[in-house]
Interface confidence: low
């Protein structure tokens, strides 16, 4: 058993048939030492008298809180939860598998730049009684400040007959250094409690693997006389860091018919500009990428060639 | 070339060389499959590599004060990942083509010390680590290890010369 | 769901080669880090060798200089060749995916294998 | 080459029943590097355990894998009908990668 914060704690289970479970003790936060009571939740049922109350606690009717009064009058809180292990593995109930880029990725993370900032999201099919909280730090041995804010509900989709619900969270690391090569990866952890049930999650990564830029901005067409080309120019996203001569962005543009069967066309530059034929009803696409390190691309911009 | 009393180096020629190695060592070593995170239980792990830190001043605003510092790490590391790929876990079994992307990684980086640190001009290296694996096998997962470093590292000193050729070239 | 699908069974003389080829259909496949383990009739598996990214190719030394394990990636079809056969080559001859592993927080071929062709029979016999 | 021996070559069981098999190496095999595998007669091998201990996707949680540096056990802790096969322990730790012998486990 552990202190997840104040008066919450979490018990450790190996969750099998007829498993033992594990047998807590519980201390009554007063002074006082007589006349004291033990109930669970909100049944008035007396499960013990006197300063401790010892449980064996097996399965989820054990959990939830348990109250010491006197005569009455509430004495102290001891909420537990339970965390389930089956067959040496920490359950995944909670999180949604989002199976990319690997299966059991419950967390995905994302930067647009390379100040330190970052996002995860993460996805479940539960809608009520779910609380979430992240931890995050440079490094775990000896751990660098990194602060997340709260994480909150970012979306919802209907997939099938189920609801799917996304949750997201920005964090920052605290004395980022745009310009140096990670040594050490961010780790990320969260804790989701639903009900009384308790699991967390992890992951890890350097900055520099999960940047994605914006995509292009200002995307534009300038016919060129008597052809059929035309010049495409686009501007660095404002969310890139800068200066734009340190940090630099390839592009990748791509003229693409109508129909997806269409052969695409495709030119990379280090320039924010490219020549290209457009074609009758085809759109002129262009992604960035990290100039240097290839992680993943943008989404694409796009404007129609007409 | 960053000769004796610190002159700057031939800026351009550094980016284009820079930016070669880097496309070298993604096509040495692309992504394959997906990145994953680390499964607990990997016990080599081999951090030992010279790292370019927040302190050596390769920011713009660093390199603008004094290119020099940065420029002599990025030196180290250079030297360093080019006796690593000259060493047996890169010549060993199991043997690379000689026209391997690795090989060419290699050339490449003795290109770009040379260009940093003419000949009779010696700024201190840092010390190769006696990492030899006996195996084949193990061999294999180091040279995994020593690449993805090495993609960071390249990456680095690309945008510091790319960052030199465009603000501090004469 | 990829699936490893080789060539049908071979009988050969004494002496003479025998390919075998690993085909991956229904998904992504990369030759690279395709094993090859045989098996003889009533008997155990041996690992033979392997096409490994960063390390060209390697074999076991029973089967250094006899066997040849090459790839096309444009067919995602990997290759095993085996020549001068002799009697005891009579074998199930199986391809295997590694199963992925990390090192350092990257992918590596961990050399245990979580995805098998169907097998294939080669009989040496005069 | 690392030699791989199992124990015991056969193992006779009823089903419902805990079967333990063992696998002991010539030299020191680190437990990243030690796989199980599970065979039935005409078909392919199957990954049980990898990393000595962790279950590979879709393998039932009664198979378990347990052990380090020489001695390895693969448990079962109630047999199936569809248990009754020969199961392989295999290490990559060092080239060639080796297997065991094998385990035939039979029904009773």
């Known amino acids: 058993i552990w202190e997840l914060k104040k008066d919450v704690y979490v018990v450790e289970l190996d969750w099998y048939p007829d498993a033992p479970g594990e047998m807590v003790v519980l201390t009554c936060d007063t002074p006082e030492e007589d006349g004291i009571t033990w109930t669970l939740d909100q049944s008035s049922e007396v499960l013990g008298s006197g300063k401790t109350l010892t449980i064996q606690v097996k399965e989820f009717g054990d959990a939830g809180q348990y109250t010491c009064h006197k005569g009455g009058e509430v004495l102290s809180h001891s909420l537990l939860l339970l965390h389930k292990k089956e067959d040496g593995i920490w359950s995944t109930d909670i999180l949604k598998d989002q199976k990319e880029p690997k299966n059991k990725t419950f967390l995905r993370c994302e930067a647009k730049n390379y100040s330190g900032r970052f996002t995860c999201w993460w996805l479940t099919t539960i809608s009520t009684d779910l609380t979430f909280s992240v931890k995050s730090s440079r490094g775990s041995s000896d751990p660098q400040g990194v602060t997340c804010g709260a994480a909150t509900l970012s979306a919802e989709r209907v997939r099938g007959d189920n609801k799917e619900y996304e949750y997201s969270v920005e964090c920052q690391e605290d004395s980022a250094c745009p310009a140096a090569e990670e040594s050490l990866p961010i780790e990320v952890m969260v804790d989701a409690v639903h009900k009384l049930k308790y699991e967390n999650y992890t992951s890890s990564f350097f900055i520099r693997d999960i940047i994605k830029p914006d995509p292009p901005k200002n995307l534009q067409l300038k016919p060129l006389k008597n052809s059929r080309q035309v010049e495409v120019s686009w501007e660095y996203p404002d969310t890139w860091s800068t200066p734009h001569s340190y940090f630099s962005l390839t592009f990748c543009v791509q003229v693409q018919g109508k129909s997806k069967r269409e052969k695409k066309d495709r030119v990379f530059t280090d320039k924010t500009s490219a020549t290209v034929i457009c074609r009758k009803n085809a759109s002129i696409s262009v992604r960035a990428q990290d100039r240097y390190y290839s992680s993943s691309w943008s989404e694409w911009a796009s404007v129609p060639c007409s | 070339r960053a000769v004796p009393g610190g002159s700057s180096p031939a800026w351009t020629q550094c980016q284009q060389l820079s930016q070669k190695l880097c496309t070298l060592a993604w096509s040495a070593h692309p992504l394959v499959g997906h990145m994953d995170l680390r499964e607990e239980g990997d016990e080599e792990t081999t951090n030992d590599v010279p790292h370019i830190q927040c302190g050596d001043g390769c920011d713009p605003q660093g390199l603008r004060d004094n290119s020099q510092f940065c420029l002599q790490r990025i030196h180290q590391g250079l030297i360093f990942y080019e006796k690593l790929l000259g060493s047996d876990i890169f010549t060993g079994e199991p043997s690379l083509l000689p026209d391997s992307p690795v090989a060419q990684l290699h050339a490449s980086l003795l290109g770009l010390s040379q260009l940093l640190q003419p000949e009779g001009h010696h700024w201190e290296t840092q010390q190769i680590p006696s990492l030899s694996p006996s195996q084949p096998w193990q061999r294999l997962l180091l040279r995994f290890k020593i690449l993805r470093s090495l993609q960071a590292f390249v990456a680095v000193a690309a945008r510091v010369f790319a960052h030199g050729a465009a603000t501090l070239s004469p | 769901q990829v699936q490893l699908v080789q060539s049908g069974a071979e009988v050969k003389k004494p002496g003479s080669s025998v390919k075998v080829s690993c085909k991956a259909s229904g998904g992504t496949f990369s030759s690279n880090y395709i094993s090859w383990v045989r098996q003889a009739p009533g008997q155990g598996l041996e690992w033979m060798g392997i096409?490994?990214?960063?390390?060209?190719?390697w074999y076991a030394q029973k089967f250094q200089g006899r066997v040849t394990i090459t790839a096309d990636e444009s067919t995602s079809t990997a290759y095993m060749e085996l020549s001068s056969l002799r009697s005891e080559d009579t074998a199930v001859y199986y391809c295997a995916r590694s199963k992925k592993g990390m090192y350092g927080g990257w992918t590596y071929p961990l050399m245990m294998f979580d995805l098998w062709g169907q097998g294939t029979l080669v009989t040496v016999s005069s | 080459d690392i030699v791989l021996t199992q124990s015991p070559a056969t193992l006779s069981l009823s089903p419902g029943e805990r079967a333990t098999l063992s696998c002991r190496a010539s030299q020191s095999v680190s437990s990243n590097y030690l796989a199980w595998y599970q065979q039935k007669p005409g078909q392919a091998p199957r990954l049980l355990i990898y990393y000595a201990s962790r279950r590979a996707t879709g393998v039932p949680a009664r198979f378990s894998g347990s052990g380090s540096g020489t001695d390895f056990t693969l448990t079962i802790s109630s047999l199936e009908p569809e248990d009754f096969a020969t199961y392989y322990c295999?290490?990559?730790?060092?080239?060639?990668?080796?297997f065991g012998q094998g385990t035939k486990v039979e029904i009773k």
């Open positions: 295999q290490q990559t730790s060092n080239t060639p990668f080796t």
């Open positions: 096409n490994a990214h960063l390390g060209g190719t």
